[in-house]
Amino acid sequence: TPLGPKWPEPVFGRLASPGFPGEYANDQERRWTLTAPPGYRLRLYFTHFDLELSHLCEYDFVKLSSGAKVLATLCGQESTDTERAPGKDTFYSLGSSLDITFRSDYSNEKPFTGFEAFYAAEDIDECQVAPGEAPTCDHHCHNHLGGFYCSCRAGYVLHRNKRTCSALCSGQVFTQRSGELSSPEYPRPYPKLSSCTYSISLEEGFSVILDFVESFDVETHPETLCPYDFLKIQTDREEHGPFCGKTLPHRIETKSNTVTITFVTDESGDHTGWKIHYTSTAQPCPYPMAPPNGHVSPVQAKYILKDSFSIFCETGYELLQGHLPLKSFTAVCQKDGSWDRPMPACSIVDCGPPDDLPSGRVEYITGPGVTTYKAVIQYSCEETFYTMKVNDGKYVCEADGFWTSSKGEKSLPVCEPVCGLSARTTGGRIYGGQKAKPGDFPWQVLILGGTTAAGALLYDNWVLTAAHAVYEQKHDASALDIRMGTLKRLSPHYTQAWSEAVFIHEGYTHDAGFDNDIALIKLNNKVVINSNITPICLPRKEAESFMRTDDIGTASGWGLTQRGFLARNLMYVDIPIVDHQKCTAAYEKPPYPRGSVTANMLCAGLESGGKDSCRGDSGGALVFLDSETERWFVGGIVSWGSMNCGEAGQYGVYTKVINYIPWIENIISDF
């Protein structure tokens, strides 16, 4: 019996009946065995077929078989109801071998020419399966020459049988307080040969509750308990299950914060699996009762472990723990069923006693000592000598705990000293140097340092003076002895002030003329304003109208008198302003250098002499009455003059203050 070619030889060829293309003889039997490589099959087709036809091909036939299975028994030329001729059919082996048997009986009624067939090995496509047959692979099948292989979708791994896809369904840990978990692919059939482990792990104090929902379908057996596929639930206390079948298991209250769910499947079956909805509970905390004037948020039926609430106070109330304020309050429920913080109080906001107002006072409007939310107080300044700056003085205790003005300011109002008040009623003409009376020149300041000089009080902590008067002390401000509130130069009864800093105009050059002869002294403390100590006003923009030629100004000081000594009592003199050209001309002849009188100076005095300021008066104010405001203002600062005070044809020269208003304002605002 010819075997035919065997792999690894090339597997293809031709078969024919004996004597082909002539007629075949009687009593012939011929067998061919074709073998292809593993993973290949054999394909066979006939190019010629002419055999004796007999019932069920009992006489002459060609039989094709593969293993134990007969693929076809062929005879005749064309197929009939009961006999089959190959025609144009192609035949395929079931495996890698094909047996072909040819037989003729003892007689032929007429000559038959037999058959001719061709064969070849071809790759088997193992991935193609007949309808109703189980697929070759669980998920993906990949054919190749001589074989195939299977692969799996993401989340699965190929079983060692190389065909089944087992689910990668272990190691999932659920830490939320509630959630859902289900068999892989639910509600589609779950995978075979899988072992799934799910963990629910909540914080200590929680207890997990399991509810099976929707449907439950796990392969079962009528007699044995879950022998194929099963679901088990394990806690640190007990094991539940195994579960299988089609009935939803009952709720499981685990009384544990950790649960392990195991699901094991075998290699067969087609079941949809299961779905679990889990929740958790814990020992509830006492229901939070909001403090008076407060409310709890969020409002819940109960509060368990990790639940929290916050307290919010009504407007005008604040969170307090005892005396200590809180911006916010949140309490968290602990595992033992207690809150982690005690309930605070919502106390009415108390702005506290209002701060004292320097040179002023405060009055409780709502009621004596009432300082709580919406209480009203009224600040006012000491009458006559102080006035309130840009504020009506009314403050309300607001919800933020601060006293707040109607303009929304939280800072105190400011009591500014009233400037330019004097007890003196001015005469219209010059009567000569006179003794000052109490309250006539309350801005007058006596400056004792290396020499005697003067100055004028501005506000309640600045002194305006001449640069030349304090130049030597500019780096040692504390050396200046500043006295005010007295008429007698040598009196022990005065108000003492000390200098914190001296500011000399940057345009002043010592011993080189008197241009920019102006300085400010900052006092280290505010002085108390009264009838004997009152600041002088700075000139308004319109002040020039009260300082024209022949307008009267008043100079005061303890400088040299006609007798040649410093005055014991404060003296003053009313003197007219001198035309600027006239004054400039008076100081252009020797011994004065040209340009001694500048635009930053003004002159005052009598052409006939006799009325003048003198040494010791330096730095003092030449003041004028503003008839519109009825306040005195400083127009000049005693600066320089002729060697002989009060000399005819010579005049006192004063620093023109109106030229320095920006400089003064900048220094005061900066320091």
Partner: antibody, heavy 114, light 107 residues
Amino acid sequence: QVQLQESGPGLVKPSETLSLTCTVSGYSITSDYAWNWIRQPPGKKLEWMGYISYSGRTSYNPSLKSRITISRDTSKNQFSLKLSSVTAADTAVYYCSRHYGDYWGQGTLVTVSS
Amino acid sequence: EIVMTQSPATLSVSPGERATLSCKASQNVGTNVAWYQQKPGQSPRALIYSASYRYSGIPARFSGSGSGTEFTLTISSLQSEDFAVYFCHQYNSNPLTFGGGTKVEIK
């Protein structure tokens, strides 16, 4: 984590003003709570001096009210103590702390002496 | 002001034993009381607030109780690191005040 650190001169002359600063890290002083100054004279008990709250409001021990000022610099996350007209009785270790004492500075000894 | 009186001034206890420290307020302070531990050269360490609430990180052997005017700090089993001075503190009203301290020493 929250840390408080006091700083300032260790020696102050009588009648002068004692100034200390507490620098807070790990928490904003405007977020919440009261921020205290507490002192402990040698061998004596702790004395609360006052606080400044998250909103900037202050509360002082009445025994010190005329001399004490507590202020803050929110840009630097600091709060400060000023105690004027000091005497030898103000010699102490000065601490800053948060609220009812969950966090404290390490303390700084201030001696009042000429 | 509210005076906080601690007793005893000194408490001698053997390691492993229980220590009970008392603090009395001169007026009702609710539960607005804190307890501190202080060791030489160190700043106070907060143990308890609101009379009975233990700060996180504080061992469970420390517990506080009381309300109104009488308060107690209990150390259930003294460890070597617990020997120190303990202060009570009321923060109920201005001025906030402290007790004079109880020194817990090794017997």
